[in-house]
């Protein structure tokens, strides 16, 4: 037999199918020009020493073969003895290791069998009523096709599906969408209405994410507040990566999960902008304010569930950085200015109350005064910090107040509002004899002592009513008792106590009269 012809003799090997799992498969035959034809197939298994034979049976029942050797592609002309205008049955027999392996048969009319291409180029993926919709441009001159898809997940084998007949310049397919796992899809096409025509090759993988992006499992930590009043937010655990099917590993456009960081600054509610979305990789520096941080995962089908963390405010206080002067017109605060043209946010809230009750005021951009201080003033009528109670004050600063990640904490401290000098006056002053020339003076703690760092000291004043001599005794803010010694029996004294802050002298308590009785010896 000539090599260019189909040989109508018995093939040079015994006729017995081994039934092994390996062997030839995916036989495709089609016309490639006006008078030339091509058949190609795949061979599964070790290829060493394998010889392939393309078998053909005509409608008359006569059969022939082409010897392809080790090649898995063979071309022949319409003069090779194979009927091209009538239906023929073709298959491949591969002779290897003293056994024959057969491919599935294809029955077709060669002249009308055109080589169909799989979907080429961009396959658009979208979600439609809980299903996956794929759409692509029909390859040139190939309108009219049957389309199949196959899909797999990381843990399941290929499953075959049908897209139905297509007859337009664009083709589409509805496929199942998995809720929580990524899928790999491939598509193939064949000529519509041509009996037994060959399937095209499978397309390149189309990688599809799950309908729900995975919930980000990440952890944050926040560093200590630095000298600049900022602390770095750091990511302790990276988000888990989505498991991908085999053909999507490595580069898998389409399955990417994007993680974004949404920052919500809870403190200083009077600022212009409270939230900002950032890249998860670009961890911000934060002020000492309280924040909510959400990690939002999204894929090409939209956002998934987010995970939110609360970052509490840094409560480290600076007891001396804030100067407060109370005048007849109102109150003025002074603190070391940060830089030129800074906007400050002064936030205050009554101690022991819910953080949601914080009040704040935003200053216009200001430069430091000649002493390098920044200021904020308010009148009594404004009602700001007007109640006689302890307030927690935080001052934030920013040169770009509209940028959430540019706020820094200047200071945090406590302040006693209202008429602190009067409200702080100690009550229940009592005097007890201690010895022949001394007494113990006790009093109830000043309201100022409820405000950390506000009460600087108590002062106890003792006045000798005879000589009008006055002595003053400073007492630590943590103490509420003092012993007055060197007193004379039979002399009338008055004692008063006041509570002082760093910037304000207190009001004396009501005078308490006492005397040490003269001891008469027997």
């Amino acid at each position: 037999c000539r090599t260019s012809e189909c040989c109508f003799q018995d093939p040079p090997y015994p006729d017995a199918d081994s039934g092994s799992a390996s062997g030839p498969r995916d036989l495709r035959c089609y016309r490639i020009s006006s008078d030339r034809y091509e058949c190609s197939w795949q061979y599964e298994g070790p290829t060493a020493g394998v010889s392939h034979f393309l078998r053909c049976c005509l409608s008359s029942g006569r059969c022939c073969y082409f010897a392809a050797g080790s090649a898995t592609r063979l071309q022949f002309s319409d003069q090779a003895g194979v009927s091209v205008l009538y239906t023929v049955t073709l298959w491949v027999e591969s002779w290897a290791r003293n056994q024959t392996e057969k491919s599935p048969e294809v029955t077709l009319q060669l002249y009308n069998s055109v080589k169909y291409e799989p979907p080429l180029g961009d396959i658009k993926v979208s979600k439609l009523a809980g299903q996956l919709r794929m759409e692509w441009e029909t390859p040139d001159n190939q309108v009219g096709a049957e389309v199949q898809f196959r899909h797999r997940t990381p843990s399941s084998p290929w499953k075959l599906g049908d897209c139905g007949p297509q007859d337009d310049d664009t083709e589409s397919c509805l496929c199942p969408l998995e809720m929580n796992v990524a899928q790999e899809f491939q598509l193939r096409r064949r000529q519509l209405g041509s009996q037994g025509s060959s399937w095209s090759k499978w397309s390149s993988p189309v990688c599809v994410p799950p309908e729900n992006p995975p919930q980000p499992q990440v952890r944050f930590s926040v560093e200590q507040l630095g000298q600049d009043g900022r602390r770095r937010l750091t990511l302790k655990e990276q988000p888990t990566q989505l498991e991908l099917p085999e053909g999507c590993q490595g580069l898998a456009p389409g399955t990417e999960v994007t993680y974004r960081l949404q920052l919500h600054m809870l403190s200083c509610p009077c600022k212009a902008k409270a939230t900002r979305t950032l890249h998860l990789g670009k961890m911000p520096y934060l002020s000492g304010a309280a924040y909510n941080v959400a990690v939002i995962s999204s894929n090409q089908f939209g956002p998934g569930l987010n995970q939110t963390w609360h970052i509490p405010a840094d409560t480290h206080t600076e007891p001396v950085a804030l100067n407060i002067s109370v005048g007849t017109n109102g109150t003025t605060m002074y603190w070391p200015a940060r830089a030129q043209s800074m906007t400050y946010c002064i936030e205050w809230q009554p101690v022991g109350q819910d953080g949601g009750l914080a009040t704040c005021s935003l200053t216009a951009p200001q430069d430091p005064d000649p002493a390098g201080m920044a200021t904020y003033s308010w009148s009594r009528e404004s009602g700001a910090m007007g109640q006689e109670k302890c307030y927690y004050i935080t001052i934030f600063a920013s040169a770009h107040p509209e940028k959430l990640t540019l706020w820094s904490t200047v200071l945090s401290t406590y302040h006693f509002g209202g008429n602190a000098s009067a409200a702080g006056t100690p009550h229940h002053v009592s005097v007890k004899n201690h010895s022949l020339d001394s007494v113990s003076v006790d009093w109830a703690p000043s309201l100022l002592s409820t405000c950390p760092g506000v009460l600087k000291e108590y002062v106890v004043r003792c006045r000798d009513e005879d000589s009008k001599q006055v002595s003053e005794h400073p007492v630590q803010p943590t103490e509420t008792q003092v012993t007055l010694s060197g007193l004379r029996a039979g002399v009338a004294y008055t004692v008063q106590v006041r509570a002082d802050t760093a910037w304000l002298r207190g009001v004396w308590s009501q005078p308490q009269r006492f005397s040490i009785e003269v001891q008469v010896s027997d």
């Epitope: 994007t258 890249h279 670009k282 961890m283 770009h400 990640t405």
Partner: antibody, heavy 119, light 107 residues
Framework: EVQLVESGGGLVKPGGSLRLSCAAS????????MNWVRQAPGKGLEWVGR??????????DYAAPVKGRFTVSRDDPKNTLYLQMNSLKTEDTAVYYC??????????WGQGILVTVSS | DIQMTQSPSSLSASVGDRVTITCQAS??????LNWYQQKPGKAPNLLIY???DLETGVPSRFSGSGSGTDFTFTISSLQPEDIATYYC?????????FGGGTKVEIK
């Protein structure tokens, strides 16, 4: 006041090398991710490369046309960013800008420096 | 790479006119988009960040909007000093990419 000042540009022959510097001041340079962006004469803006802060690993990324030829580095104590350009081609002729990373805290650009690659 | 398609490439308008420039990203970039103004011989100057936020010190006649893939930049009342080339830039993904630019001239 924030400043980024590029230097080291000039005329170089194809195949030659050049190192650009960018001196930063007025902000915490060590915290910043920094970029190089270029603009060919009469053309649009093109990103060249980026370096992250040391605290974020100090890793670098490059645009495809310069990968393997250009290297971005930083010297935090000197507040300086560098761009080492090797195997220069005529199409590398451009004004090179040093910039902070967009979406970071600030967006600062230097005044730019001209690099001409010509025989 | 994410392609940024900016249009128009040039426009001519009268002082006081409302000017609109669009920028389309080839994929979703959330709100990670900047708008820059560049005057001849100068470095670009940031006007809008995060798609719609006005940079400090930028006049309020400039504004931005959009999210995902479609973005708009507007000058509500064109002034003579607004003659420049305007660029959009995405910073969602590397490589950072810019639109081709829009040259704004005064009639």
């Amino acid at each position: 006041e924030v400043q980024l000042v590029e230097s080291g540009g000039g005329l170089v022959k194809p195949g030659g090398s050049l190192r650009l510097s960018c001196a930063a001041s007025g902000f915490t340079f060590s915290n910043a991710w920094m970029n190089w962006v270029r603009q060919a004469p009469g053309k649009g803006l093109e990103w060249v490369g980026r370096i992250k802060s040391k605290t974020d690993g100090g890793t670098t990324d490059y645009a495809a046309p310069v990968k393997g030829r250009f290297t971005v580095s930083r010297d935090d104590p000197k507040n300086t960013l560098y761009l080492q350009m090797n195997s220069l081609k005529t199409e590398d002729t451009a004004v090179y800008y040093c910039t902070t990373d967009p979406g970071w805290e600030f967006d600062y650009w230097g005044q730019g420096i001209l690099v001409t690659v010509s025989s | 790479d994410i392609q940024m398609t900016q249009s128009p490439s040039s426009l001519s308008a009268s002082v006081g006119d409302r000017v609109t420039i669009t920028c389309q990203a080839s994929q979703d970039i959330s709100n990670f988009l900047n708008w820059y103004q560049q005057k001849p011989g100068k470095a670009p100057n940031l006007l809008i960040y995060d798609a719609s936020d006005l940079e400090t010190g930028v006049p309020s006649r400039f504004s931005g909007s959009g999210s995902g893939t479609d973005f708009t930049f507007t000058i509500s009342s064109l002034q003579p000093e607004d003659i420049a080339t305007y660029y959009c830039q995405q910073y969602d993904n590397l490589p950072l990419t810019f639109g081709g630019g829009t040259k704004v001239e005064i009639k």
